[in-house]
Amino acid sequence: SQVSQNCHNGSYEISVLMMGNSAFAEPLKNLEDAVNEGLEIVRGRLQNAGLNVTVNATFMYSDGLIHNSGDCRSSTCEGLDLLRKISNAQRMGCVLIGPSCTYSTFQMYLDTELSYPMISAGSFGLSCDYKETLTRLMSPARKLMYFLVNFWKTNDLPFKTYSWSTSYVYKNGTETEDCFWYLNALEASVSYFSHELGFKVVLRQDKEFQDILMDHNRKSNVIIMCGGPEFLYKLKGDRAVAEDIVIILVDLFNDQYFEDNVTAPDYMKNVLVLTLSPGNSLLNSSFSRNLSPTKRDFALAYLNGILLFGHMLKIFLENGENITTPKFAHAFRNLTFEGYDGPVTLDDWGDVDSTMVLLYTSVDTKKYKVLLTYDTHVNKTYPVDMSPTFTWKNSKLPNDITGRGPQ
């Protein structure tokens, strides 16, 4: 139901949902620090623009008694319970930041009259696509699907001369929240990925995956999985792998591949890693000293959510427009704003665009090297290394089906 918003007379409040169930196991204190860092920046920005207003955040904690699994499985009701708490206390701000779990975001969006914008660090699933007042600041599954289809179809690069139309997807149900929804999107029979591929089979058991690696009767040479190198090693170990197998390891929120002293282990030679272009900014930030490279993106999304709100607030105030209107609620899309780490672009549906990077392991240097980049905003691939030192024959990616000639 409608809740009155603390969002007028020069005082603007941000409601931040601090849920026990979260897309990433990040201490809530770190997220608070990220929000507070963002607030400092926004306040300064507004003051410099001659806008003498107050911006604050209210952190809404759930009691944690009922919803305490710590992951997203029991998040559906936690989000609604928090909204109820806000409603009862009449403490709704101009904008809602959180939740991060797909289940809770979907349910909250469904069960409320959203006359305010909702900004999420997460909500990766396809069920959160195309929501008019929802903004997602971490790459959703739809963006991954579009990359994969684009890459599968590509056949005019020196290192990829075959179009692919087949794939295995490894999904065993123990994935992290981001991976769960990424793989869920690839598995869904009605998804763009499934529609564009001629053959796709989901491998659910470790043994199924392991058998495929050397199975002469396999239907595809390409296996998509999601996680880090350690996850792959646990599954694959030092098993032999057929020379034309290509493993695509989706590991978007992990900067470790770009660190200077990182050497790729031997088991990564048949692997292409899909990750996001790294940022450089959080190393000296007050809120980020305790963050691991895999967590920085989550905290950064919270911070950027605050900055996005500040950006929109500044525009509306400068134009003399009301904040508590549907126009404001629907405005958080189709724009570029200054994020902490550089410009952030949101597409027509409020989803963050980014540069995805496909890495390979150089057989010469045992280092991760950039093979190509992909701009999700324009759905375009840009080759970087035209002569990669691949493990695959002739330094070219193999066909996806063994024995099939050029297309």
């Epitope: 920005r45 410099n48 623009a49 001659g50 940022g279 900014s281 930030s285 200054e338 994020g339 902490y340």
Partner: antibody
Framework: EVQLLESGGGLVQPGGSLRLSCAAS????????MNWVRQAPGKGLEWVSG????????YYADSVKGRFTISRDNSKNTLYLQMNSLRAEDTAVYYC?????????????WGQGTLVTVSS | EIVMTPSSATLSVSPGERATLSCRAS??????LAWYQQKPGQAPRLLIY???TRATGIPARFSGSGSGTEFTLTISSLQSEDVAVYYC?????????FGQGTKLEIK
């Protein structure tokens, strides 16, 4: 007390390169954008380049785009301006200026400037 | 690019009198405007930002007003130490720009 100290200026031939540095102290360096502003002899102020607090955003005046590169090292509290393909019209006093904002705002503290002379 | 144009290159005002400096933007910059004072051989000093907010340590005789495209810096009672060049600057976007400056003299 906020202090900004520029260095690296000097005489250079047309087409040459110089790297200016600005050592900052007295404030949380990574929280604020930094800028380079120049002033040709007897002329007004011209904004040259700016960089956000994190270093994630960089911007340039059209007159220097493609020739100058701004950067910062937040661990050393230092701002840099790499100037390549220098021209006679780049001759000026170059000021390092601290922003009041994380991005683009007014400049609340300025260094004393370093003179760059481009001449053969 | 937003062009900032001062109303005059030079302004002569008697001591104790009011000095009014104006600046026009080629397009709206809302209230993202600053005024600076620069004395010979010195770096510029921030006087006003956000069109009307005095920077730290700036005397109350300095005030700013305006929004959109028309801005004014007023010195209510001119002192001899106020002789300087005054610059307006818009910072509504990253490509900030300065006016050419107004030289304020004692009449």
């Amino acid at each position: 007390e906020v202090q900004l100290l520029e260095s690296g200026g000097g005489l250079v031939q047309p087409g040459g390169s110089l790297r200016l540095s600005c050592a900052a102290s007295g404030f949380t360096f990574s929280r604020y954008a930094m800028n380079w502003v120049r002033q040709a002899p007897g002329k007004g102020l011209e904004w040259v380049s700016g960089i956000s607090g994190s270093g994630g955003s960089t911007y340039y005046a059209d007159s220097v785009k493609g020739r100058f590169t701004i950067s910062r090292d937040n661990s050393k509290n230092t701002l840099y301006l790499q100037m390549n393909s220098l021209r006679a019209e780049d001759t000026a006093v170059y000021y390092c200026a601290k922003d009041r904002d994380f991005w683009s705002g007014p400049f609340d503290y300025w260094g004393q400037g370093t003179l760059v002379t481009v001449s053969s | 690019e937003i062009v900032m144009t001062p109303s005059s290159a030079t302004l002569s005002v008697s001591p104790g009198e009011r000095a009014t400096l104006s600046c026009r933007a080629s397009q709206s910059v809302s209230r993202s405007l600053a005024w600076y004072q620069q004395k010979p051989g010195q770096a510029p000093r921030l006087l006003i930002y956000g069109a009307s907010t005095r920077a730290t340590g700036i005397p109350a005789r300095f005030s700013g007003s305006g929004s959109g495209t028309e801005f004014t810096l007023t010195i209510s009672s001119l002192q001899s130490e106020d002789v300087a060049v005054y610059y307006c600057q818009q910072y509504n976007n990253w490509m900030c720009s300065f006016g050419q400056g107004t030289k304020l003299e004692i009449k």
